[in-house]
Interface confidence: medium
Amino acid sequence: PEPPTACREKQYLINSQCCSLCQPGQKLVSDCTEFTETECLPCGESEFLDTWNRETHCHQHKYCDPNLGLRVQQKGTSETDTICTCEEGWHCTSEACESCVLHRSCSPGFGVKQIATGVSDTICEPCPVGFFSNVSSAFEKCHPWTSCETKDLVVQQAGTNKTDVVCGPQDRLRA
């Protein structure tokens, strides 16, 4: 029979042969042969693999570093990574929760919709057209673009969500 060019789900192609992938929580020790099955071994105490795989090494569980204000929210298993969260009163800086802030800042281009409280973090919102924020701040709202017209000036450079408009003198020349 012809050697396969593709394999079924949860299999992989090696040496013109379809081998079974290792199940989550296990790593590959040796590929299958014509006569033997794929050999897999469970991940160690602080390791995991969360997919059907052919990895020869398991991934280390995430370390929730207390020096960064982190603590374990959910202990990892052989099939799942550890999930970290922040100490009470602190907030994760990202979805991955790799560090903690007392309250998050809104990046340039975003303004504060709601200042943080003891229980809720800063709520940011994108600056809409006509408004900008050029700072990273836990407090500042989006500022409106300067109105050149009210100063009897014209727009020399358009504003963005991160920059104010640049005003300049009107061209006094008349045809």
């Epitope: 020096n67 560090s99 802030v101 700072v135 836990a138 407090f139």
Partner: nanobody
């Protein structure tokens, strides 16, 4: 290297006043929003006040509004906190902070004790 050094703490009677200072170095001071936070004995960290880089906008926790005033002198790279009408519940170690990451770019703090 970022350094923040607080001073001005001490023992004061209820109703009294203190002025805290924070000398900053190692970064362009005027570019950054600065904060005061405090930790009361046996309690968590509490944000107190913040000020914009240019010093024009100030923000306060409800617990200190009307009693504390934050200010800065960018020419001296110094942050201030004027504390009036002090109460026993204001007793804490006060820290100035450049950013509110968990103890990242924080000073060592200055102890304020309000007691009769």
């Amino acid at each position: 290297e970022v350094q923040l050094l607080e001073s001005g703490g001490g023992l004061v009677q209820p109703g009294g006043s203190l002025r805290l200072s924070c000398a900053a170095s190692g970064f362009t001071f005027g570019w950054y929003e600065m904060q005061w936070v405090r930790r009361a004995p046996g309690k968590g960290l509490e944000w107190v006040s913040a000020i914009s880089g240019d010093g024009y906008r100030t923000y306060y926790a409800d617990s200190v509004k009307g009693r504390f005033t934050i200010s800065r002198d960018n020419s001296k790279n110094t942050l201030y906190l004027q504390m009036n009408s002090l109460r026993a519940e204001d007793t804490a170690v006060y820290y100035c902070a450049k950013e509110l990451l968990y103890f990242d770019y924080w000073g060592r703090g200055t102890l304020v004790t309000v007691s009769s």
